[in-house]
């Protein structure tokens, strides 16, 4: 088992994740593990010396950086909120606040916007990941309705009048529920047609 530092004529190292090629000395040196940085560079006789990232800084990967990255907050004004704190090994984890989606992305979400309302008769298509994109409104399926303009309202099944011992007075639509009435109630004049034999 060859341990760093070791010479490399072809400029490649055995373990690409944990080692790097140092061209000045033509050697392979150890990278520093996550949560640390290079405090002393390697030489032909000595491997890389690593030190732990200071508070409020981090390095996520095996690296040969001479500094740690500064932890950044999740700015509420940008629609972001924190879901996990920054550690020496991981940046602050942010997400869009409820009812929002990521509107600007640069390696990570930088700005969120409010989800669009879905009009009556529709609902937002369910997404694999919350906050990833704006609402895509789809019509309520048969036998369902949704009667508000809302980013999050779901289509509900039409009421089944017979389940409540009632009869249907008016059928449900995509935007309204079924109207029920008591069987004993007489129909309004416009609905009671006279049947002539």
């Amino acid at each position: 088992q060859v341990v760093p530092p070791y010479g490399s004529e072809n400029q490649t190292c055995r373990d690409q994740e944990k080692e790097y090629y140092e061209p000045r000395h033509r050697i392979c040196c150890s990278r520093c593990p996550p949560g640390t940085y290079v405090s002393a560079k390697c030489s032909r006789s000595r491997d890389t010396v690593c030190a732990t990232c200071a508070e409020n800084s981090y390095n996520e990967h095996w690296n040969y950086l001479t500094i740690c990255q500064l932890c950044r907050p999740c700015d509420p004004v940008m629609g972001l909120e924190e879901i996990a704190p920054c550690t020496s090994k991981r940046k602050t984890q942010c997400r869009c606040q409820p009812g929002m989606f990521c509107a600007a992305w640069a390696l990570e979400c930088t700005h969120c916007e409010l989800l669009s309302d879905c009009p009556p008769g529709t609902e937002a298509e369910l997404k694999d990941e919350v906050g990833k994109g704006n609402n895509h409104c789809v019509p309520c399926k048969a036998g369902h309705f949704q009667n508000t303009s809302s980013p999050s309202a779901r289509c509900q099944p039409h009421t089944r009048c017979e389940d409540q011992g009632l009869v249907e007075a008016a059928p449900g639509t995509a935007q309204s529920d079924t109207t029920c009435r008591n069987p004993s109630e007489s129909l309004p004049p416009e609905m009671s047609g006279t049947m002539l034999m």
Epitope: P76, V77, M78, G79, E82, Q97, P98
Partner: nanobody, 112 residues
């Protein structure tokens, strides 16, 4: 449109304490994360503390261990408890959230 009104600032001696309040209106309060920001004379506004909808908190290194951010959802209010105040904490303090209008802020002066 979200309106925010900050209060509770004043003149305090080094080592003293203050509690800032921020009353919000025009938003579903419990669905919003909030931040306390400050702007010292001649400097840029900086974020000092945040609180998420779930109550997770973040603090800038300069105030960690001294300031405590909290929220009262029924009262639509966010607080900033400031302890062990230092002269360098002197600034106008603002609270804000998504689509919030920057309020007048509240002036905190730490001086003997």
């Amino acid at each position: 449109e979200v309106q925010l009104v900050e209060s509770g600032g004043g003149l305090v001696q080094p080592g003293g304490s203050l509690r800032l309040s921020c009353k919000a209106s025009g938003t579903t309060f419990s669905d919003r994360a909030f931040g306390w920001y400050r702007q010292a004379p001649g400097k840029q506004r900086e974020l000092v503390a945040t609180i998420s909808t779930a109550g997770l908190t973040w603090y800038d290194v300069s105030v960690k261990g001294r300031f405590i951010i909290s929220r009262d959802n029924p009262e639509n209010t966010v607080y900033l408890q400031m302890n062990s105040l230092r002269p360098e904490d002197t600034a106008v303090y603002y609270c804000n959230t998504f689509r919030g209008n920057w309020g007048q802020g509240t002036l905190v002066t730490v001086s003997s």
